[in-house]
């Protein structure tokens, strides 16, 4: 019997200090560039080697960025989201959603990794 794939979703506040070459990551998404079906959110698509985000170590490719310095990223055009990051200042606070894939046992049985009750 095939296993079931679940996701463990957690949120984290990440404070980054802009480095010499910036924050050091790429994004996809936006109302005009949906990366995930039925979700116009902003996602991290690349962490640049030796950049501020990589050196901090907490932000991961695939993370959804919910807000920047308290400003919600919902319903933004892609380029508007890019501009928001570029104009965010030296100290940047990111509210991010991590989505960890959890492989469970056969359907009908709760495996050890099952995040439910």
């Amino acid at each position: 019997m095939n296993g079931r794939v679940d996701y463990l979703v957690t949120e984290e506040e990440i404070n980054l200090t802009r480095g010499p070459s910036g924050l050091g990551f790429n994004i996809v998404g936006g109302t005009d560039q949906q990366y995930v079906s039925n979700d116009s959110g902003i996602y991290v698509s690349r962490i640049k080697e030796n950049g501020a985000a990589a050196l901090d170590g907490r932000l991961q490719e695939g993370d959804k960025i919910l807000s920047v310095n308290g400003q919600d990223l919902k319903n933004l055009l892609h380029q508007d989201a890019v501009d928001l990051f570029r104009n965010a200042g030296y100290a940047v606070s990111l509210r991010v959603q991590h989505r960890l894939q959890v492989q469970n046992g056969p359907i009908g049985h709760r495996g050890e990794g099952d995040p439910s009750g």
């Epitope: 990551f25 990366y35 640049k48």
Partner: nanobody, 125 residues
Framework: DVQLVESGGGSVQAGGSLRLSCTAS????????MAWFRQAPGKEREFVAA??????YYADSVTGRFTISRDNAKNTVYLQMNSLKPEDTAVYYC?????????????????????WGQGTQVTVS
């Protein structure tokens, strides 16, 4: 990683035209920033053109002669090269990176890109 395959190179006389194509394997091609670089024998790799979500960028040496475009339905980026000169002779490489940098975009910096094609030779005599 995305696989990139260039085509369309060849030999042409000065003043002639060629159209290079670069086809990518990724399922979210429309989100990729794409670029063309070139390398002549004995010279460093040189930026030619790039296309991101926000628009197109060109090296001064090709502005007005070359045009970069993309067809997201075909997962392909093109480089239309007109009024070719002998100094355009080089191996032309396609490069890609997923998404847009949140930092100042430097289209001519090879470190902006993660994936590279094998190249296609262009010879102008």
């Amino acid at each position: 990683d995305v696989q990139l395959v260039e085509s369309g190179g060849g030999s042409v006389q000065a003043g002639g035209s060629l159209r290079l194509s670069c086809t990518a394997s990724g399922r979210t091609f429309s989100t990729y920033t794409m670029a063309w670089f070139r390398q002549a024998p004995g010279k460093e790799r040189e930026f030619v053109a790039a296309i991101s979500w926000s628009g197109a960028y060109y090296a001064d040496s090709v502005t007005g002669r070359f045009t970069i475009s993309r067809d997201n339905a075909k997962n392909t980026v093109y480089l239309q090269m007109n009024s070719l000169k002998p100094e355009d002779t080089a191996v032309y490489y396609c490069a890609a990176v997923i998404g847009s940098t949140v930092d100042s975009y430097r289209p001519g910096d090879p470190l902006e890109y993660d994936d590279w094609g094998q190249g296609t030779q262009v010879t102008v005599s």
